[in-house]
């Protein structure tokens, strides 16, 4: 994608300005494109260092501008050169007084290896002097002054390479300044042939077309372009692919045009001399006018462009029928595209007959870098080409080129790429609240690292430690509730931020860890504690059924009221009861139990208990006696707890009866505090002693409590509270 | 789209002569060098004959020198190969190329000549 | 006539592991003056003509996907595939067309490990 132009205008110098112009036409050459004498063409030249000029009308080029008054320091041989991605181009000129004695036919004469070649030069002024000519500055010939001819002419039978360089001619009492020259090229292999070794074929570079001895490819005349030059580009315009336009008010007219050797330099198609401006004659055209055209049917001859062939016929005489040949064009590529980093499919869609085909479209990087398609297909009417970045990066914007070049012809179009950085959050979210199956978050979007605008954000989570993919919601507040999540589960989360505009998506942002709260099975059904022993309580429960097919157990947990002992204890869950034992005597204990899965369950309420007591119990405490009518009293009491009582006794008989002679009462309900004696006598005097009985024994009163009856018609005295047995 | 279309394979005793053509589009035809190869069953390639794009030029293998000959019709878009004095060793599946630089672009979708008594 | 030799013969490689196929010419393809290399590579698959990847030894050919890339210079090049497909499964070929006739090498199978 190289394509170096010089423009030499006017190579001819009188007092006019004159200029040199480097045009680097679509592409970006890594280094500033240089222009300097030629010293290898002309030692002798002046030595002044040039002031070279960036041309403000055009990219990439650079400009040599010499006012009038130094024309007397411009004759010489120049170059301009170009690089990209280590190949250098050089292209070379030259510059002459106007008011030398000879004038060259041409300024560059290109042959082919074998050639029989005549450089000549026109005799402009007659003088009485020997006439000399130099090649590249050492003098290589003399025509005594009597015998100078019109025409001084330097014959080659059989050209070389080693014969190519700047040709002088001038009368010996000249210089530099009166001397014209002319450039031989010699194409390093003969006519048609190309390679290292000369022994490849050219392909037919048409409209004088130069094949490269290197490479085989054609150099287009200015004014013509594709891969064989067979097309003409549009009026006044030149370049590889025909986008660079003359701005003169008659076109490419005085402009000289330089390409890399082998081409040299000629005219724009339609103009012819050497200064470049003078019209072509009718029924010829091309660079410095050297083609005929022939056309077949009668067409008009454009001086520019060849045969105008008539509709359904085409060729460079209208030889051949067949639709017309149109030039492509590039078609729905915007000037601007904003990109983000990552992946990127550009598309160079194109138009044109025949149409493009995958290999005559190509994409040019900022940096040169040519490529090609990577998929491609087309429709009746147009071309397209997608190419693949697989990751474009910032440094990879700037002014991408879509190339297109077909027999037709060829079109660039520069686009420029802006390259985004994707947004990351700089922080990990917040979690503000846990449930067992929701959280709620506070997203924490900004501040982020990347380029905005932020289009849309999602908030990715998922379990740690599972193998499953992430899942997201797409955000709009910054604060949002995750519903639906498992309990007891850690999760993670983190923020992605979506800019506009293809592959937006930014890299997720620093991850935050949450455990959600529990939640399992049910409690066992049908708790009950109870002492079994001195050391050991037994707790029992309905019998199990879970719903799923997850294993599960029970896990019962105890401790003391009075000790900080805590057991957890698992259970098989196709058990019912379990023995709790290695408690201490006359002790509380809590118990509590809850099914778990994999998940842990909900505990059941509290259960307490004590174990059975290793001591006989204390005396009922607060005995009263009350309620007393002629035929009954209410006797109530307190136990203390902890002692294992399991009954009370009430034991009364008449004062002054045998002992054998008592009654007793026995109350299995150690919960109940009072009890109603029934069917005494009246007027009568009793002894009531209490006792309470354990796994040991019966406690020992201290002493007995006295009743007395009241007669049989009076009201009972003392009423007394608490909960009574009828 | 650029297309190579080949013809007028088929079996040959040895001694005797084929024709094989090569019918173009897509392209201009009288801009290109056209070129012949050929690959014998289960072997590699081999380059046989090439022909300049006005058909002044003309190339050809030492192994068919002087039996081959390569010919072109750019007014009918068409390139011949003329194949005298056939060999057992000529049986090949033949392809017309056309360049891009010295390496062989755009190529026919071959022939199958078989040269056997 | 330079010949062309390429190394090895046959090759087998797992999907997705990257192949590597040498070619060595008889004589230097260098070209001092443009510092180019006149080296192509091409695929073939049964049944089809040969399909051009490579030229200048290194310029990827409009379309060929940019897992197949070309290396070396001077008498010794590589062909390599980055991360193997199943439609790469072919045979190839070098050329070299630095002076004529243009030569091929023998040619590599590539097969599915």
């Known amino acids: 994608a190289m394509d170096l132009i010089l423009i030499n205008s006017l190579p001819l110098v009188s007092d006019a300005e004159t200029s040199l112009t480097c045009i680097a036409s679509g592409w970006r050459p890594h280094e500033p494109i240089t222009i300097g004498r030629d010293f290898e063409a002309l030692m002798n030249q002046h030595q002044d260092p040039l002031e070279v000029t960036q041309d403000v009308t055009r990219e990439w080029a650079k400009k040599v501008v010499w006012k009038r008054e130094k024309a007397s320091k411009i004759n010489g041989a120049y170059f301009c050169e170009g690089r990209v991605r280590g190949e250098a181009i050089r292209i070379r000129t030259m510059k002459m007084r106007q008011q030398a004695s000879f004038l060259p036919a041409t300024l560059t004469m290109t042959v082919d290896k074998g050639d029989n070649v005549n450089i000549s030069f026109k005799k402009v002024l007659i003088k009485e002097e020997d006439a000399v000519i130099y090649k590249n500055g050492s003098f290589i010939h003399s025509v005594p002054r009597h015998e100078v001819p019109d025409i001084l002419e330097v014959h080659l039978p059989h050209a070389q390479p080693q014969d190519a360089g700047v040709y002088s001619a001038r009368y010996i009492g000249g210089n530099l300044f009166t001397s014209a020259f002319t450039r031989l090229i010699v194409r390093r292999c003969e006519a048609q042939k190309w390679g290292p070794e000369c022994n490849h074929l050219c392909t037919a570079c048409m409209n004088n077309g130069v094949c490269h001895e290197d490479t085989g490819e054609c150099i287009c005349p200015p004014g013509f372009m594709g891969r064989t030059c067979e097309k003409a580009c549009e009026l006044h315009t030149f370049g590889r692919t025909c986008k660079e336009r003359c701005s003169g008010q008659e076109g490419c007219k005085s402009y000289v045009f330089c390409l890399p050797d082998p081409y040299g330099c000629s005219c724009a198609t339609g103009w012819k001399g050497l200064q470049c401006n003078e019209a072509c004659h009718p029924g010829f055209y091309g660079p410095d006018c050297k083609l005929r055209c022939s056309c077949n049917n009668g067409e008009m001859c454009d001086r520019f462009q060849g045969c105008l062939c008539s509709p359904g016929w085409q060729g460079l005489q209208c030889e051949r029928e067949g639709i017309p040949r149109m030039t492509p064009k590039i078609v729905d590529l915007p000037d601007h595209i904003e990109v983000n980093s990552g992946k990127f499919n550009p598309i160079c869609k194109a138009s044109g007959w025949p149409l493009p085909t995958n290999e005559e479209m190509t994409l040019v990087k900022p940096d040169g870098t040519v490529l090609h398609p990577k998929d491609f297909n087309h429709t009746d009417h147009f071309s397209v080409a997608i190419f693949t970045i697989h990751r474009i990066l910032p440094p990879d914007s700037g002014v991408w080129v879509c190339s297109v070049n077909t027999v037709a012809g060829m079109v660039e179009k520069p686009f420029n790429i802006s390259v985004k950085v994707l947004p990351k959050p700089l922080n990990a979210p917040n979690v503000i609240d846990t449930g067992h199956n929701f959280a709620v978050i506070n997203i924490s979007s900004e501040p982020y690292f990347g380029d905005g605008p932020i289009k849309s954000k999602k908030l990715l989570y998922k379990p740690v430690n599972h193998y499953e993919a992430w899942q997201h919601i797409q955000v709009t507040n910054e604060i949002v509730t995750l519903n639906y999540l498992e309990p007891r589960t850690e999760y993670e989360l983190c923020v992605q931020l979506v800019r506009r505009g293809e592959g937006g998506e930014g890299h997720p942002g620093p991850v935050r860890r949450f455990t959600t709260a529990s939640i399992g099975l049910p409690p066992p059904r049908g708790l009950n504690l109870l002492p079994k022993s001195q050391t050991t309580l037994n707790l029992t429960w309905q019998p199990i059924f879970p719903s799923s097919e997850d294993d599960f157990y029970v896990e019962v947990e105890r401790r003391s009221v009075q000790k900080s002992d805590q057991q957890n204890i698992k259970v098989p869950g196709n058990l019912t009861s379990v023995l709790l034992n290695n408690l201490h005597p006359r002790e509380q204990y809590v118990v509590r139990a809850r099914v778990n899965t994999k998940a842990q369950g909900e505990w059941s309420e509290d259960l307490t208990a004590w174990t059975l007591s290793d001591i006989l119990p204390p005396q009922p405490e607060n005995i009263k006696i009350s309620n007393i009518t002629h035929s009954s009293a209410v006797i109530s009491w307190t136990i203390l707890d902890g002692y294992s009582i399991s009954s009370i006794t009430i034991r009364y008989k008449v004062q002054g009866k045998n002992e054998d002679q008592h009654v007793d009462v026995k109350i299995k309900n150690a919960t109940i505090t009072q009890y109603q004696l029934k069917g005494l006598e009246p007027e009568t005097a009793y002894q009531v002693d209490i006792f309470a009985e354990n796994n040991i024994g019966s406690s020992n009163p201290a002493f007995s409590h006295e009743l007395v009856t009241l007669p049989e018609s009076q009201a009972p005295a003392d009423l007394g509270g608490g909960k009574m047995l009828l | 789209q650029v297309q190579l279309v080949q013809s007028g394979g088929g079996v040959v005793q040895p001694g005797r002569s084929l024709r094989l053509s090569c019918a173009a589009s897509g392209l201009t035809f009288s801009n290109y060098a056209m070129h012949w190869v050929r690959q014998a069953p289960g072997k590699g390639l081999e380059w046989v004959a090439v022909?300049?794009?006005?058909?002044?030029?003309?190339y050809y293998a030492d192994s068919v020198k002087g039996r081959f000959t390569i010919s072109r019709d750019n007014s009918k878009n068409m390139l011949q190969l003329q194949m005298n004095r056939l060999r057992s060793e000529d049986t090949a599946v033949y392809y017309c190329a056309t360049p891009k630089g010295g390496a062989l672009e755009i190529w026919g979708q071959g022939t199958v000549i078989t040269v056997s008594s | 006539d330079i010949q062309m030799t390429q190394s090895p013969d046959s090759l087998a490689v797992s999907l997705g592991e990257r192949a590597t196929i040498n070619c060595k010419s008889s004589?230097?393809?260098?070209?001092?003056?443009?510092?180019?290399?006149?080296l192509a590579w091409y695929q073939q698959k049964p049944g089809q003509p040969p399909n051009l990847l490579m030229y200048w030894a290194s310029t990827r050919e409009s379309g060929v996907p940019d897992r197949f890339s070309g290396s070396g210079s001077g008498t010794d090049f590589t062909l390599t595939i980055s991360s193997l497909q199943a439609e790469d499964v072919a045979v190839y070929y070098c050329?070299?067309?630095?002076?004529?006739?243009?030569?091929f090498g023998q040619g590599t199978r590539l097969e599915i490990k």
């Open positions: 050329q070299q067309y630095y002076s004529a006739p243009i030569t």
């Open positions: 004589a230097s393809v260098l070209y001092s003056s443009n510092n180019k290399n006149y």
């Open positions: 022909i300049s794009y006005d058909g002044e030029n003309k």
